[in-house]
C-alpha cells in the first residue's frame, strides 16, 4: 500500500521520513508544526507595518493577522492607497503618500517641497544621521545610513523597499536589523540557499540586464 510519505505531506520544503506509526517532517528554518505548515513569523516579530495592529491567527495556517489603520491595506499593511497619481513632484522626484500629506523625495541635485530647486554641489551641504554627501556629474546627493532616506537623510526609510531577500523571501524590519522569511524551499539569512543541497546544481537565472551596481528598477 502507499507509504505515509507518499505525496510528501510536509509543506514549505520540509522533508518527510517514515516512523513506525506514521511520518515525521523535518522543517526548514523558519517553519514548524506537524507538517511544517506554521510560519515562524509571529506578532513578536512585528510584521505589521504602518501602525497595523497584530493579533494571533485563529488557525494554525495563519500565525498572525494584521488589522490595518485607515489608508493602508495588504496582509502586512504594506500597501497604501495611491494619491500620487497626479505626479506633484518635479524633476523626477519620488512622491510619498504619508496619509496626512504628500511629500516629495527628490533626486540627487534637487530640493524643495516639490523638488523645484536645482542644487549643484556638496559645499555647505549637511547629510543627517550619518549620511555622506556624494558628488558626481554636476549633481550631488546624500548617501544615507541604513534606515534613513530623503534629500538630507532626515526621513526614516523602509530598508525592505530595496528587496534584500532572495528567491521571493519576505522582508521584515526590526530594531535589530532586517529579517527575511523565506519562501518554501529556501534558507539562509537572505534566503539565498536552496533547502535541499542535493537538488538542482544551478539557481534560477537572474533577470537579464540587471547588474548589482545598476540603478534598481
Amino acid at each position: 500500500g502507499p507509504g505515509p510519505c507518499d505525496g510528501n505531506p510536509c509543506a514549505n520544503g520540509g522533508s518527510c521520513s517514515e516512523t513506525p506509526r506514521s511520518f515525521e517532517c523535518t522543517c526548514p528554518r523558519g517553519f514548524y508544526g506537524l507538517r511544517c505548515e506554521v510560519s515562524g513569523v509571529t506578532c513578536a516579530d512585528g510584521p505589521c507595518f504602518n501602525g497595523g495592529l497584530c493579533v494571533g491567527g485563529a488557525d494554525p495556517d495563519s500565525a498572525y493577522i494584521c488589522h490595518c489603520p485607515p489608508g493602508f491595506q495588504g496582509s502586512n499593511c504594506e500597501k497604501r492607497v495611491d494619491r500620487c497619481s497626479l505626479q506633484p513632484c518635479r524633476n523626477g522626484g519620488l512622491c510619498l503618500d504619508l496619509g496626512h500629506a504628500l511629500r516629495c523625495r527628490c533626486r540627487a541635485g534637487f530640493a524643495g517641497p516639490r523638488c523645484e530647486h536645482d542644487l549643484d554641489d556638496c559645499a555647505g551641504r549637511a547629510c543627517a544621521n550619518g549620511g555622506t554627501c556624494v558628488e558626481g556629474g554636476g549633481a550631488h546627493r546624500c548617501s544615507c545610513a541604513l534606515g534613513f532616506g530623503g534629500r538630507d537623510c532626515r526621513e526614516r526609510a523602509d530598508p525592505c523597499a530595496a528587496r534584500p531577500c532572495a528567491h521571493g523571501g519576505r522582508c521584515y524590519a526590526h530594531f535589530s536589523g532586517l529579517v527575511c522569511a523565506c519562501a518554501p524551499g529556501y534558507m539562509g539569512a537572505r534566503c539565498e540557499f536552496p533547502v535541499h543541497p542535493d537538488g538542482a546544481s544551478a539557481l534560477p537565472a537572474a533577470p537579464p540586464g540587471l547588474r548589482p551596481g545598476d540603478p534598481q528598477r
Epitope: 555622506t132 541604513l146 535589530s176 536589523g177 539562509g188 539557481l203 548589482p212
Partner: antibody
C-alpha cells in the same frame, strides 16, 4: 560613486594587535555587505570574513578562529577589522570589499567594488 | 569548508588566441561563482558573477559557464591587456557553521605572447 578606502595598516610586532578601518560611501547596506580579504606578498587571495550590517550579522572563515573581529559604525559608514595575536604569516595587504548580496530580490554574492588595500607587516 | 581548485596554475597564449581556466568546487555551490582579474600592484577587478553574468564594463570576450561544481572562464581574442592573474570565488553553505562563506581559488597566471 561607490567607494571603499582602507586605513590603519603598518608595522606591528609579533603577538601585537592592529585595528584597520574602512570608510565606505555611495551605497545602501540593504543590498550590500562588506568583506575583508587579504593577500600575502606574491600569494593568492584569502577571504577573512564579511559583515551584513542591515541584518546585523557577521561571518568568518573557519581559519580565523576568533583572532580577527569585524565590526561596523553605521552612523559613520565605517567598518573595522580588529587583528589580534598577529604572526609573520599575517603579513599581507588587507582589502576592504563591497559584496553585492541580494539586489532587487536577486542573489549575487560577488565582490564588485574593491578598496586599494592597506599593508600590514608583522615583524620584530 | 569548500576547496576551490583552479587549473592550470599558469597558461601562455598568443594575441588573438583563446584561454580556458577551470575551477572545481569540492561541493555544490549552485551558481554562486565569480571571476576576478588582478594585475600587479592593483586590487582585483570583478569580471563575472553568478557563473556567467558579465560585470559592468567587461567586454564580451570574457565568458563564464558551468554549474554545481565545475566552472570555466574562457577569454577569446586575447589582448596584451589581458595578461594578469585570474581568480575564481565561490559562495557556499557551510553546514558545519550553518551560514554562508566565501572561498577563492589559487589563481591562474595568464601570459600573453
Amino acid at each position: 560613486q561607490e567607494q571603499l578606502v582602507e586605513s590603519g595598516g603598518g608595522l606591528v610586532q609579533p603577538g601585537g594587535s592592529l585595528k584597520l578601518s574602512c570608510k565606505v560611501s555611495g551605497f545602501d547596506f540593504s543590498n550590500y555587505g562588506v568583506s575583508w580579504v587579504r593577500q600575502a606578498p606574491g600569494k593568492g587571495l584569502e577571504w577573512i570574513g564579511y559583515i551584513d550590517p542591515a541584518f546585523g550579522r557577521t561571518y568568518y572563515a573557519s581559519w580565523v578562529n576568533g583572532r580577527f573581529t569585524i565590526s561596523s559604525h553605521n552612523a559613520q559608514n565605517t567598518l573595522y577589522l580588529q587583528l589580534n595575536s598577529l604572526t609573520a604569516a599575517d603579513t599581507a595587504t588587507y582589502f576592504c570589499v563591497r559584496v553585492a548580496l541580494v539586489v532587487a530580490g536577486v542573489a549575487y554574492y560577488g565582490m564588485d567594488v574593491w578598496g586599494p588595500g592597506t599593508l600590514v607587516t608583522v615583524s620584530s | 569548508d569548500v576547496v576551490m581548485t583552479q587549473t592550470p596554475a599558469s597558461v601562455e597564449a598568443a594575441v588573438g588566441g583563446t584561454v580556458t581556466i577551470n575551477c572545481q568546487a569540492s561541493q555544490n555551490i549552485y551558481s554562486y561563482l565569480s571571476w576576478y582579474q588582478q594585475k600587479p600592484g592593483q586590487p582585483p577587478k570583478l569580471l563575472i558573477y553568478r557563473t556567467s553574468t558579465l560585470a559592468s564594463g567587461v567586454p564580451s570576450r570574457f565568458k563564464g559557464s558551468g554549474s554545481g561544481t565545475q566552472f570555466t572562464l574562457t577569454i577569446s581574442d586575447l589582448e596584451c591587456a589581458d595578461a594578469a592573474t585570474y581568480y575564481c570565488q565561490s559562495y557556499y553553505y557551510s553546514s558545519g557553521s550553518s551560514y554562508g562563506a566565501f572561498a577563492f581559488g589559487g589563481g591562474t597566471e595568464v601570459v600573453v605572447k
